[in-house]
Interface confidence: low
C-alpha cells in the first residue's frame, strides 16, 4: 500500500487584487478513508478556508469534482482577492474517525503573496574621493516590494563581490517591504573606467533583475607622480625644462613654476592627455633665459591635486661653459 | 509536471495575421515569464523577447518590434504570440520558454514548436 | 549586442569519441553561457547553464567549461543519439542572444 503524499506543488502563489487565485493540491493515495479540508496558517488558531462537508465558503469552488469516487485533486480556486486573503495555505488529510475525524498528514504549505516590484536598485558611493588599495562603501537601495524574498548581488566589472551586508525591513508581515545593503570595496589604480552593479532579483521580475550602478570615477583619487626634466639642446638663450605630471584622476590641477623660490608668472605651454585607464597625463614646459652672469638655477615644478596638499618636484639646472658660450639656434 | 503546449501548425499568406498560443500547467503561470523563441529554416535560434505574465509587460528584441505582440490570458494560463502583416521570412518554428526567476536566464522548459508557413 | 560565434557548423566524430564544441562571445560574458541540444522535430533541452552547471537529470558525459569570451561543451563518450545541433546562448545581458549553432554528425 503506498503511503500518502500531499502535493502542493507550489511554494508560492503570486496574486493580484480582484483576481481569482487557484491552490493546487493532489494526493497520491485513497488511502486512508476521510476529508482534505484547507486551512490558512498553521496551529490551534488556523483558518479553515474550505470544508467540503459543512460550512459555507462562498468564495471558493473546488476545481474537480470532489464527490467522484476515485478523485485526488483537491486544488481549490478563490475568488476577488484582497490583500486581507495573503498567508500559507495547507490541504490537510483527515482520518474518519468517531466521535471525530482525526488529522493525518499535511501538504508543505502554498504561500499567498500580493506581489509588488521592488523600486530601481539606487547605488551611493562614497562623499569624499579616496585613493587606491584603500577600501571604499557603497550603498544600494530598493523599496516597496512583496513578497519579501529577495535576491541581491554586487558586482565590479561584471565580478561578483562577496564582502556586502543586507538588510531586508521589516522582519515581521508587511504589505511591502526595504532592501538596504552595504559594500565594501578595494580600489585599483585603474578603477577610473571601473563600475560597480548592485542587482536586485525578485519573484515579480521573473528572471528580468534590476539594475543600479555607480561609477568608481566618483569615489577615487589617483594621485600624480611628478618628473622635472631638463632638455638637452637650448633655444638661443633659453632651456627648455619639462615637468611631467602622470597618471592622475580627476582632471582638477594646478601647477606653478617657482626659479630659486621665486613664483614665475609668465606664461608656459602645456598639453593634457587622457590614457586608456581613464588617468590624465599634463606636461608642462618651462623656458629659463641662461646667461653669463646668472647664478646657479633651481626650478621648482609643484603641483596641487584635487585640493590636496601640494606636491613638487626641484631640478638644479645644468648650464655648462659650452651651452653659454653657443651662438647658434638649436631646436629642442 | 510542468508542461508548455503550443498551438497547431499555421499555413498563411503573406499579408496575414497569425496567432499562435503557448498553454502552461503544472506551476503557478503568474510567476513565472514567457520567452518566445524563433528558429527560421536552416537558421539558428533567436531570441524574440518575452512577457512579464504577473505585470503584462512584454519586452522585445530590436528585430521584433513593430509586426511582433506578445499577450496573455491568465485565466487560461496562456501566453500568444501574433505577427501582423505576415512576411515570407516569418516563415519559421516559433517556440515559447519558461523563464525561471533566479540569476539563471537559460530556458529549461520548452514548447513544442508552432511552424508557420508563409505561401502566397 | 552580445554575438556569440560557434566556429563550427559541422563535426563528424565516432561513436565513443571524446568530442568539444566551441563558442565565442563577442565581449566577457562571465561565465553566463548555456547549452542547449536540438534534435530534429524536437523542442531544444537546457544541458549547461553558468557555462559548467549540469541542468536536472543530465547525463554527466556533458560536461561545460570556459570563461571570459571562450566556452567549451564536451561530450566524453558520445553516442548514436547525440547526433542533433548545439547552441550556446550566453544569459549575461539581453537581448539573450544564441550562437549559429553546431551540427553534431556520427560517422
Known amino acids: 500500500e503506498e503511503e500518502l503524499q500531499m502535493i502542493q506543488p507550489e511554494k508560492l502563489l503570486l496574486v493580484t487584487v480582484g483576481k481569482t487565485a487557484t491552490l493546487h493540491c493532489t494526493v497520491t493515495s485513497l488511502l486512508p478513508v476521510g476529508p482534505v479540508l484547507w486551512f490558512r496558517g498553521v496551529g490551534p488558531g488556523r483558518e479553515l478556508i474550505y470544508n467540503q462537508k459543512e460550512g459555507h465558503f462562498p468564495r471558493v469552488t473546488t476545481v474537480s469534482d470532489l464527490t467522484k469516487r476515485n478523485n485526488m485533486d483537491f486544488s481549490i480556486r478563490i475568488s476577488s482577492i484582497t490583500p486581507a486573503d495573503v498567508g500559507t495555505y495547507y490541504c490537510v488529510k483527515f482520518r474518519k474517525g468517531s466521535p471525530e475525524n482525526v488529522e493525518f498528514k499535511s501538504g508543505p504549505g502554498t504561500e499567498m503573496a500580493l506581489g509588488a516590484k521592488p523600486s530601481a536598485p539606487v547605488v551611493l558611493g562614497p562623499a569624499a574621493r579616496t585613493t587606491p588599495e584603500h577600501t571604499v562603501s557603497f550603498t544600494c537601495e530598493s523599496h516597496g516590494f512583496s513578497p519579501r524574498d529577495i535576491t541581491l548581488k554586487w558586482f565590479k566589472n561584471g565580478n561578483e563581490l562577496s564582502d556586502f551586508q543586507t538588510n531586508v525591513d521589516p522582519t515581521g508581515q508587511s504589505v511591502a517591504y526595504s532592501i538596504r545593503s552595504t559594500a565594501r570595496v578595494v580600489l585599483d589604480p585603474w578603477d577610473v573606467r571601473s563600475q560597480v552593479i548592485c542587482e536586485v532579483a525578485h519573484v515579480t521580475l521573473q528572471g528580468d533583475p534590476l539594475r543600479g550602478t555607480a561609477n568608481l570615477s566618483e569615489a577615487i583619487r589617483v594621485p600624480p607622480t611628478l618628473e622635472v626634466t631638463q632638455q638637452p639642446m637650448r633655444v638661443g638663450n633659453q632651456v627648455n625644462v619639462t615637468c611631467q605630471v602622470r597618471k592622475f584622476y580627476p582632471q582638477s590641477l594646478q601647477l606653478t613654476w617657482s626659479e630659486n623660490g621665486n613664483v614665475c608668472q609668465r606664461e608656459t605651454a602645456s598639453t593634457l592627455t587622457e590614457n586608456k585607464d581613464g588617468t590624465y597625463n599634463w606636461t608642462s614646459w618651462f623656458l629659463v633665459n641662461i646667461s653669463d652672469q646668472r647664478d646657479d638655477v633651481v626650478l621648482t615644478c609643484q603641483v596641487k591635486h584635487d585640493g590636496q596638499l601640494a606636491v613638487s618636484k626641484r631640478l638644479a639646472l645644468e648650464v655648462t661653459v659650452h651651452q653659454k658660450d653657443q651662438s647658434s639656434d638649436a631646436t629642442p | 509536471q510542468i508542461q508548455l503546449v503550443q498551438s497547431g501548425p499555421e499555413l498563411k499568406k503573406p499579408g496575414e495575421t497569425v496567432n499562435i498560443s503557448c498553454m502552461a500547467s503544472?506551476?503557478?503561470?503568474?510567476?513565472?515569464?514567457m520567452n518566445w523563441v524563433k528558429q527560421a529554416p536552416g537558421k539558428g535560434l533567436k531570441w524574440m523577447g518575452w512577457?512579464?505574465?504577473?505585470?503584462?509587460?512584454?519586452t522585445y528584441a530590436d528585430d521584433f518590434k513593430g509586426r511582433f505582440a506578445f499577450s496573455l490570458e491568465t485565466s487560461a494560463s496562456t501566453a500568444y504570440l501574433q505577427i501582423n502583416n505576415l512576411k515570407n521570412e516569418d516563415m519559421a518554428t516559433y517556440f515559447c520558454?519558461?523563464?525561471?526567476?533566479?540569476?539563471?536566464?537559460?530556458?529549461?522548459?520548452w514548447g513544442q514548436g508552432t511552424l508557420v508557413t508563409v505561401s502566397a | 549586442d552580445i554575438v556569440m560565434t560557434q566556429s563550427h557548423k559541422f563535426m563528424s566524430t565516432s561513436v565513443g569519441d571524446r568530442v568539444n564544441i566551441t563558442c565565442k562571445a563577442s565581449q566577457d560574458v562571465s561565465t553566463a553561457v548555456a547549452w542547449y541540444q536540438l534534435k530534429p522535430g524536437q523542442s531544444p533541452k537546457l544541458l549547461i547553464y553558468w557555462a559548467s552547471i549540469r541542468h536536472t537529470g543530465v547525463p554527466d558525459r556533458f560536461t561545460g567549461s570556459g570563461s571570459g569570451t571562450d566556452y567549451t561543451l564536451t561530450i566524453s563518450s558520445v553516442q548514436a543519439e547525440h547526433l542533433a545541433l548545439y547552441y550556446c546562448q550566453q544569459h549575461y545581458s539581453t537581448p539573450w542572444t544564441f550562437g549559429g549553432g553546431t551540427k553534431l554528425e556520427i560517422k
Open positions: 503544472g506551476y503557478s503561470f503568474t510567476n513565472y515569464g
Open positions: 512577457i512579464n505574465t504577473y505585470t503584462g509587460e512584454p
Open positions: 520558454a519558461r523563464q525561471p526567476y533566479d540569476y539563471v536566464p537559460s530556458f529549461p522548459y
